[in-house]
């Protein structure tokens, strides 16, 4: 069995450099002079003057001693007698203080101190010499140990290679004893033959005690750089990996802590462990129940997996994700939860591991620890959740997690808020249950508050706005959410985000949110009063000019500005204006900004979605006679007639509606011809009675699943504005955190067509629109 001292070393392995030196002093029973422990070496003085080095003397203590010591009275004879005793024994007291080992056993020396707990003045004066004596003794012992080991090592090396396993066992015990003392430990690690013999013995023995002693020796050597190198050069890593299969706990513990030290501090160790099949062995050990053992094992996995795709795949193939998630569900030991969350964080950037962690219940398991007092654990869980969140939009049982995330939006820690907003953005994307849940737990108010508090911190505002955009469409609580943004004073700050210093990704998300908010008639006036319309038009003009400039320069490829295509901005702004134009006062403002020429020009766009929103906004504006005339005057009839034949039924339907409204004041025969044209165009595939079809709503569903941010994705954007410091265990720079991001363009519906007023009889029952090609609204870009 491993001794208590042996097993205590497991704790040290977590921070070997700091603890090793101290622990070896402790193991040798060296006396503590107070230098190492800082233990006080002074006591209150009987003189009543206190300690001259102490500023603050406890006078009550001094007075107490006076009263205690001298409450009885002495005769002159007694005083003289005591003085005589003290004078006679002065030399012995000095010797007792400085050289206690020279005293005869049982000899009684009267003390000058009444309280035995307090040292006398002589004892206090003797302390430096005692410390010096201990130092000299230690030095002599060290030299003796070194000499002894130097002489013993060649013979012990031979015995470790002996055929007689009994001799080998005894030699292993002796070497282990030597490895516990610093001087002899250094002698061992300086003998390559000895280290090789230890390694060979460890992996070849069938004897439990031999295995324990050799593994223990290597563990003791692993606290020193020289020892690590010696183990590495002697082929110790494959041998230690082999020992991970040992049924003996103490052997297992020694092996894993030694490997941990090698992985942390020895160059080349990671590759050697991987080649020796260490990853598979370590994953298999995750079903053990010793939390300290698991903490070291998971940290080894993190070191091996970090930045190494092959290792991540081996962990996956060995069943790592499920085992790691089980740990997060089962244990409460903070260090273990932290190291496990670090492994999951590293794995959560791997596209193969991501779904496996989610399937194993990783989201829910990580969510359990978001209210833990350990900030480092919470932060790791949040990073991991954010990385996983774009692959978890179809997960069930997320109620608890969503509730906690909404709470965390109120945190004072910027990193926590940033992550919580990002996760909520992803989890509310194309998942109506999650949207409803977030709304029910006060998510709208929390997100609005978050945006208000965030100011111009776009790493918070962008995901928060995206989450609000998702929550304000396509679920039963969407209308409530649209109202709630206004009721919680969110409209001014939302419109403000359309202005500098906002960057394009945030502007794009905000435009989408405004479009959804405009679905609620109660928001029309406030949005207008906040100046949303002129800004949307300004952004539209700018983005359109940008696309035109590139087209005129012969560019066919859509270009990205800050990860956003300008065509997306054109489409988004036009779409928002389209919905805002349902309000008569808004239509006047839109028309007053001289937008009709631009909308007409957009009908010529090669992008169907832009054609559709342009036709849509013109359809709304055409309700007003003057606008209809202005549209016709801009030459819209030709492109609109062309669009009647579009494969996209949304485009064709809007084009028909605009043309119909433009014909309001035309002669009857013109209307008749137009009606025939519209009928033949719109029902070219499946002619049917006007009154047999459903209403005109175009409910275009979600386009696709959210995509995690990837380095090769042109729209890749990191959540992080800066790097993070290194973690305590292993190296942990930022790179691994830049994983599945939130999705700025997610979750856009296309709303029903506008009420066509008196043209309704003609338009009733037009075929429902197809639900394809809605990239800007429905996909996660």
């Amino acid at each position: 069995m491993a001794t208590q001292a042996d097993l205590m070393e497991l704790d040290m392995a977590m921070e070997p450099d700091r603890k090793a030196a101290v622990s070896h002093w402790q193991q040798q029973s060296y006396l503590d002079s107070g230098i190492h422990s800082g233990a006080t070496t002074t006591a209150p003085s009987l003189s009543g003057k206190g300690n001259p080095e102490e500023e603050d003397v406890d006078t009550s203590q001094v007075l107490y001693e006076w009263e205690q010591g001298f409450s009885q009275s002495f005769t002159q004879e007694q005083v003289a007698d005591i003085d005589g005793q003290y004078a006679m024994t002065r030399a012995q007291r000095v010797r007792a203080a400085m050289f206690p080992e020279t005293l005869d056993e049982g000899m009684q020396i009267p003390s000058t101190q009444f309280d035995a707990a307090h040292p006398t003045n002589v004892q206090r004066l003797a302390e430096p010499s005692q410390m010096l004596k201990h130092a000299v003794v230690n030095l002599i012992n060290y030299q003796d140990d070194a000499e002894l080991a130097t002489r013993a090592i060649p013979e012990l090396t031979k015995l470790l290679n002996d055929e007689d396993q009994v001799v080998v066992n005894k030699a292993a015990v002796m070497v282990h004893q030597l490895s516990k003392k610093e001087a002899s430990r250094h002698a061992i690690m300086r003998s390559p033959q000895m280290v090789s013999a230890i390694v060979r013995t460890m992996q070849n023995t069938n004897d439990v005690e031999t295995a324990r002693c050799t593994a223990g020796t290597l563990h003791n050597l692993s606290h020193h750089r020289e020892g690590l190198l010696a183990i590495f050069k002697s082929g110790g890593i494959p041998a230690l990996v082999k020992m991970l299969g040992s049924p003996v706990d103490s052997v297992l513990f020694y092996a894993i802590t030694t490997l941990h030290n090698l992985l942390l501090h020895q160059e080349g160790a990671k590759m050697a462990v991987r080649l020796a099949g260490g990853l598979q062995k370590m994953v298999a050990l995750l079903n053990k129940t010793n939390v300290k053992f698991l903490a070291i094992t998971t940290d080894c996995l993190q070191i091996l997996a970090y930045g190494n795709q092959e290792s991540k795949l081996i962990i996956l193939a060995s069943g790592g994700p499920q085992a790691l998630v089980n740990i997060m569900r089962t244990y409460t030991y903070e260090k273990l939860l932290w190291t496990t969350s670090r492994v999951l964080k590293v794995l959560s950037v791997c596209s193969s591991n991501k779904p496996a962690i989610v399937e194993a219940g990783g989201m829910q398991a990580l969510g359990l620890h978001l209210t833990d007092p350990s900030q480092r654990l919470v932060q790791n869980c949040l990073w991991t959740l954010r990385n996983l969140s774009d692959a978890a939009t179809k997960q069930e049982g997320m109620e608890g997690l969503l509730g906690t995330l909404v709470q965390l939006l109120g945190s004072d820690d910027i990193n926590v808020v940033t992550c919580a907003a990002g996760i909520l953005s992803n989890l509310t994307c194309n998942n109506y249950k999650n949207k409803m849940m977030v709304c029910q737990v006060g998510g709208i108010e929390a997100l609005v508050r978050t945006v208000l508090r965030a100011g111009d911190r776009e790493d918070i505002t962008e995901p928060a706005i995206c989450a609000l955009r998702h929550l304000t469409s396509r679920h039963q609580e969407a209308e409530m959410a649209q109202n709630a943004v206004r009721l919680h004073y969110g409209l001014p700050v939302v419109v403000k985000l359309l202005h500098p210093p906002s960057h394009w990704p945030l502007i794009k998300a905000t435009v989408g949110l405004i479009r959804n908010l405009a679905l609620c008639p109660a928001n029309h006036a406030p949005l207008r009063e906040q100046g949303a319309i002129p800004r949307l038009v300004q952004l539209l003009v700018r983005a359109h000019q940008d696309t035109q400039r590139r087209t005129s320069m012969g560019g066919t490829q859509q270009q990205f500005v800050e990860g956003v295509r300008m065509e997306e901005i054109v489409e988004g702004c036009t779409g928002a204006l389209h919905i805002l134009a349902r309000d008569v006062h808004n239509r006047i403002v839109i028309r007053g900004l001289n937008t009709i020429p631009l909308f007409v020009q957009l009908l010529y766009s090669p992008i169907e979605n832009i054609q559709r929103v342009a036709a849509g906004v013109l359809c709304e504006l055409a309700q007003d006679k003057e606008a209809a005339e202005a549209i016709e005057a801009e030459g819209a009839t030709a492109p609109l007639t062309e669009l009647l034949h579009s494969r996209n039924e949304g485009v064709a339907t809007y084009a028909a509606a605009v043309l119909f409204r433009m014909s309001e004041d035309k002669p009857q025969d013109y209307k008749k011809r137009l009606s025939v044209e519209l009928t033949s165009s719109l029902f070219r595939t499946e002619p049917m009675a006007w009154n047999e079809t459903a209403d005109l709503g175009l409910d275009i569903g979600a386009q696709g699943e959210p995509l995690g941010y990837r380095q090769d994705d042109p729209s890749y954007r990191s959540f992080h504005s800066g790097g993070y410091g290194q973690d305590a265990l292993g190296m942990d720079p930022m790179m691994e955190h830049e994983m599945g991001g939130h999705h700025p363009g997610a979750d856009y519906p296309v709303d029903g067509l506008p009420d066509l007023g008196h043209a309704q009889d003609l338009m009733d029952g037009l075929p429902p629109g197809d639900s394809n090609q809605l990239a800007w609204f429905d996909t996660d870009l």
Epitope: L148, A149, L159, V166, K170, A171
Partner: nanobody, 118 residues
Framework: QVQLVESGGGLVQPGGSLRLSCAAS????????MGWYRQGPGKQREFVAS???????NYAASVKGRFTISRDNAKNTVNLQMNSLRPEDTGVYYC????????????WGQGTQVTVSS
């Protein structure tokens, strides 16, 4: 240095028995192993059997079940009872004492010849 003296070797027919003894002279500290090794004609010296001062015995696979090792700590002797001898058991049998001190010391006897032949 401890002196080791072996005795009991000789010629024996296959299937026969022999008892080897080894006596150690001098002071022997505890934590030691006394054992027997042998060297066949044209072969390397190989381990046969050993016993610790706490009576923990160990045997080579080739002799397990046929040979028995025992020791008398008071007399500092070790005995090897060899039964069912085979021709391949032929060789010089050496007594070895390993004292596990810092540094360890190994002492060898002069050896005694055992011949198994019909």
């Amino acid at each position: 240095q401890v002196q080791l003296v072996e005795s009991g070797g000789g010629l024996v027919q296959p299937g026969g028995s022999l008892r080897l003894s080894c006596a150690a002279s001098g002071t022997i500290s505890s934590n030691n192993v006394m054992g027997w090794y042998r060297q066949g004609p044209g072969k390397q010296r190989e381990f046969v059997a050993s016993v610790t001062d706490s009576d923990l015995a160990n045997y080579a696979a080739s002799v397990k079940g046929r040979f028995t090792i025992s020791r008398d700590n008071a007399k500092n002797t070790v005995n090897l009872q060899m039964n069912s001898l085979r021709p391949e058991d032929t060789g010089v049998y050496y007594c070895r004492l390993t004292i596990m001190t810092y540094p360890p010391t190994i002492s060898w006897g002069q050896g005694t010849q055992v011949t198994v032949s019909s």
